[in-house]
């Protein structure tokens, strides 16, 4: 298949970085990282007609070019620009779902509500979801032993900079009503230090985005509090309002029922508050 051709053509040999080299605090590059990225790219472009003209070999070249031979604490958004360009994707800008600390439910939702998109439903998000990667300065090796941890080592590491870059672009592309799913079980329902709070919120374009609608997902079955009144939600409302974007908030008291009603909106029990 296309994937075999790609590997045959270049006979990639990815050597592990020797154990005596720099040890970082975070886990190393995901096993079979190049193969995984290429396989995901091929699969995604086969499934999504608007991306079928994308050349996965070029995508991989751009991906590895962003971090190979570079110090893993000195990665910039510019390093990822070629990858961002090749992964440019026109998703319906009024169908964007952002999320913070509740990825699984957000993904379950877009798997059912097929016309809405999280970042991980786009090519670039899909390629990198749940993967770790880093290289080493002045060598073409991938470090499978350890990679920098955002807190303990450095923030400008390959994975963090990738997600910051791709999240910014995703938010910039949004329009009309943008939805965000927030985890009501956490002490900070809205966290200014999350990717949503530090990147996406500040890159929504007021000339294109009319409203940000937050869906606060409740954790306990008996939790009937109005979490839209939470101080951190009020903080989010304040940040959004100052950017001339309207804000609205909804409690999702029963996430299981919420998903069920997305699947079967005709169900008689779906008219009440979820």
């Amino acid at each position: 298949s296309g994937l075999n051709d790609i590997f045959e053509a270049q006979k990639i040999e990815w050597h592990e970085v020797p154990r005596w080299r720099q040890q970082w605090s975070g886990p190393g590059t995901t096993k079979r990282f190049p193969e995984t990225v290429l396989a995901r790219c091929v699969k995604y472009t086969e499934i999504h007609p608007e991306m079928r003209h994308v050349d996965c070999q070029s995508v991989w070249d751009a991906f590895k070019g962003a971090f190979i031979s570079k110090h893993p604490c000195n990665i910039t958004e510019e390093d990822y620009q070629p990858l961002m360009k090749l992964g440019t994707q026109t998703v319906p800008c009024n169908k964007i779902l952002l999320w913070s600390r509740i990825k699984d439910l957000a993904h379950q939702f877009t798997q059912v509500q097929r016309d809405m998109f999280t970042l991980e439903d786009t090519l670039l998000g899909y390629l990198a979801d749940d993967l770790t990667w880093c290289g080493e300065f002045n060598t073409s090796k991938i470090n499978y032993q350890s990679c920098p941890d955002w807190r303990k080592d450095c923030s400008n590491n390959p994975v963090s900079v990738f997600w910051k870059t791709v999240s910014r672009r995703f938010a910039e592309a949004a329009c009309d009503v943008v939805h965000v799913m927030l985890n009501g079980s956490r002490s900070k329902i809205f966290d200014k230090n999350s990717t949503f709070g530090s990147v996406e919120v500040h890159n929504l374009q007021p000339e294109k985005v009319q409203t940000l609608e937050a869906w606060v997902i409740h954790g306990g079955r008996e939790d009937s509090r109005d979490l839209c009144q939470d101080p951190t939600i009020k903080e989010l409302e304040s940040i959004i309002s100052k950017r001339n974007i309207q804000f609205s908030c909804k409690n999702i008291y029963r996430p299981d029922k919420f998903l069920q009603c997305v699947k079967n909106p005709e169900d008689s029990s779906c008219t009440s508050e979820i």
Partner: antibody
Framework: EVQLLESGGGLVQPGGSLRLSCAAS????????IIWIRQAPGKGLEWVAA?????????YYADWAKGRFTVSKDNSKNTVYLQMNSLRAEDTAVYYC???????????????WGQGTLVTVSS | DIQLTQSPSTLSASVGDRVTITCRSS????????LAWYQQKPGKAPKLLMY???NLASGVPSRFSGSGSGTEFTLTISSVQPDDFATYYC??????????FGGGTKVEIK
Amino acid sequence: EVQLLESGGGLVQPGGSLRLSCAASGFSFNNYWIIWIRQAPGKGLEWVAAIYSPSGDIKYYADWAKGRFTVSKDNSKNTVYLQMNSLRAEDTAVYYCARELAGSSYEGYFESWGQGTLVTVSS
Amino acid sequence: DIQLTQSPSTLSASVGDRVTITCRSSQSVYGHNWLAWYQQKPGKAPKLLMYRASNLASGVPSRFSGSGSGTEFTLTISSVQPDDFATYYCQGYYSGGSYAFGGGTKVEIK
């Protein structure tokens, strides 16, 4: 002053090959995508291929150009090339190179163009 | 294939007239607004006028303006000047970093 200068155009027979050059001056090649765009006589514009070389070449092509056209770059000469093979009459056009600034606010449009070089495919 | 359709294909105007050119894309452009406009004079390369639908390129007179989003865009010249008689092209930016150009609109002297 930013300058892009195309050369290498001329008359070629159907099935023949030609290599176009785009020499850049007045800016650092490494921060820009260089895009080849063509314009058939009296017709509109059509993009052909793109290349960017911050560290290793990253290139991609319009669907119709894949296989017949190859873009490459010589950083030491600040020159981009377009190798065109199996040429057909419908490839007759003025071929322009243009630059696109590499940065998310700037990508997707071309702020500097060369003067173009004419390629005529005819027997 | 993505189609960008410009209308009209030819437009006759007098100096001082207000002129509007429309560009329709068969697919939404990236980010809803990633569309550029170029001006081309005979024997010359195109020149960037507008980018991201409504942003004026450096050195372009303020009589040029752009609007629109998604699939429908317009370029307006509020008061046509002698230097503005030329052909105008729209250009969209799409998935995978691909580009498409409109067929052009020739603005000629009435």
